[in-house]
Interface confidence: low
């Protein structure tokens, strides 16, 4: 057959779907690889062809669109499973072609099983809620396009294994789950089960997400440098090791980049001709406030190094701060020598 632009296996799209549930999968060509959409391609006389390779097989085979009750079907650029089966797992390819043009991409589809408490190998999206920050909502994800707006589905929300009914601060509101006020005890997995009718059959969509309660923006502060501080003096003799920790607390801020860095005499350590190493460690609180520690280390400090200015800097979306470390050269202990005074006495 003639040449085809092969985009290979699109592993960025690790599609996971639950067994025995509907799944609609859009051909990635139009979303990520081509500059035109399906409608344009279709009206230009291009045809979209689907085929697949079963798990642990090398043989590409056509998808059977003649299964009972149209279990697998194609609609425009969407491949439909109504519903999926475990052995639908494999690599799926969509190919767009006519006599002069061809482009194709493959993507992995994994059909996963869940238990009665919705536990499964599915990778869960994480939804962050601000602690004690008024009313916040999570929305049942990825259910668009499964049923027309004329169909009114029933939605049931669960936390872990339990249906949400009389949760003090969480209210189911259709596709939304409202948290009247979020507490750390609200951390966990929330599942919405959307049930809708189609052609005399009833389908279920199960969507689970992880809620993580994080620090509130109303409590957020600029970075706080705990060390260095005014109470600690780094007094060293030449030849000793100089270790200065820079410990910074960052309030949780959504999408904020937290940074810590040292300057020596106003320059980055890399730009100074001394043997400096910097080691960083990061820890998080339960609400994802962050503590970063950067330890500046000079193995054998010189008297010149002890005269330099060492400043710890920190920056977040809330602001920038800096603090200088107090570094001194140890003053040698005085030597008490007996000095004989000349002419001590009358002349």
């Amino acid at each position: 057959s003639e040449r085809c632009d092969d985009w290979g296996l699109d592993t960025m799209r690790q599609i996971q779907v639950f067994e025995d549930e509907p799944a609609r999968i859009k051909c990635p060509l139009f979303e990520h690889f081509l500059k035109f959409n399906y409608s344009t391609a279709h009206s230009a006389g291009l045809t979209l062809i689907w085929y697949w390779t079963r798990q642990d097989r090398d043989l590409e085979e056509p998808i059977n669109f003649r299964l009972p009750e149209n279990r697998i079907s194609k609609e425009k650029d969407v491949l439909w499973f109504r519903p999926t089966l475990l052995n639908d797992t494999g690599n799926y390819t969509c190919m767009l072609r006519n006599t002069t043009y061809c482009s194709k991409v493959a993507f992995p589809l994994e059909v996963v099983q869940k238990d009665s408490c919705f536990n499964s190998p599915m990778k869960l999206p994480v939804h962050k809620l601000y602690i004690e920050y008024g009313i916040q909502r999570i929305t049942c994800p990825n259910v668009d396009g499964y049923f027309p707006s004329s169909v009114k589905p029933t939605i049931t929300w669960y936390m872990g294994c339990y249906k949400i009914q009389n949760f003090n601060n969480v209210i189911p509101e259709g596709m939304n789950l409202s948290f009247l006020i979020a507490f750390i005890s609200n951390n966990g997995n929330y599942t919405c089960v959307v049930t809708y009718p189609e052609n005399g059959r009833t389908f279920h969509l199960t969507r689970t997400l992880t809620v993580k309660v994080v620090g509130s923006p109303k409590n957020a502060v600029p970075p706080v440098i705990h060390s260095p501080n005014d109470h600690v003096v780094y007094e060293k003799e030449p030849g000793e090791e100089l270790l200065i920790p820079c410990t910074v607390y960052f309030s949780f801020l959504m999408d904020s980049r937290n940074e810590v860095w040292w300057t020596i005499d106003g320059k980055k350590p890399d730009d100074i001709p001394i043997d400096v190493t910097i080691n960083e460690s990061i820890s998080h609180s339960r609400t994802e406030d962050e503590t970063r520690t950067q330890i500046l280390s000079i193995k054998k400090v010189t008297s010149e190094d002890l005269k330099r200015s060492y400043v710890c800097h920190a920056r977040s979306a809330k602001g920038e701060v800096a603090k200088a470390a107090t570094v001194k050269q140890k003053v040698p202990a005085p030597r008490y020598t007996v000095e004989l005074a000349c002419g001590f006495g009358a002349t």
């Epitope: 909502r137 929305t139 707006s149 209210i171 189911p172 509101e173 259709g174 939304n176 409202s178 009247l180």
Partner: antibody, heavy 119, light 112 residues
Framework: EVQLVESGGGLVKPGGSLRLACAAT????????MSWVRQGSGKGLEWVGR??????????DYAAPVKGRFTISRDDSKNTLYLQMNSLKTEDTAMYYC??????????WGQGTLVTVSS | DIVMTQSPLSLPVTPGEPASISCRSG???????????LAWYLQKPGQSPQLLIY???NRASGVPDRFSGSGSGTDFTLKISRVEAEDVGVYYC?????????FGQGTRLEIK
Amino acid sequence: EVQLVESGGGLVKPGGSLRLACAATGFTFSNVWMSWVRQGSGKGLEWVGRIKSKADGGTIDYAAPVKGRFTISRDDSKNTLYLQMNSLKTEDTAMYYCTTGELLGFDYWGQGTLVTVSS
Amino acid sequence: DIVMTQSPLSLPVTPGEPASISCRSGQSLLHSNGFNCLAWYLQKPGQSPQLLIYLGSNRASGVPDRFSGSGSGTDFTLKISRVEAEDVGVYYCMQTLQTPITFGQGTRLEIK
């Protein structure tokens, strides 16, 4: 920070039309139920209507005095709520506020836009 | 429609003294999930209303703790433990159990 900014108010003759807009920032607009509330000069608060989020079906409910004359809509791509007011009456003269939420109360309010219906 | 009735309609108070406003609804505002669909607002002169209390008794973010809400079903009360000059304005109760959403007539709090 949540902000709701209404616009489009003004003076209009009875029987005329006006379209109010409410630009929302600081929250995921598409997820939130939005309402219009009005207040006549020296009078109390009166609920005008509400539009649910599209995820909840986008259902729209209206207060009896405006049903059939007013239309609430939303453009989630523009984070904007609208109130199309037709066949305006003198009793529609009021400050119009857009608000967020519903079940647990209206948690945020705009500064309001004044509509005056007078010949 | 659920009719909301507030009393008193006017409330003169000495600063530092407590104040209490009553709100009665024409039918129970108790939601099937076990909370009351009642909110309280304060509208200060020349300003938009601000949410004080939701679900009958939950103080909204940033609201001083001198404000408290109580009650269930059809009878609700907003209490201010010690009135301050900045508390002047019109207080409204509102039900959100069902549409149309309805407000009380308002209670004007003024300093004696």
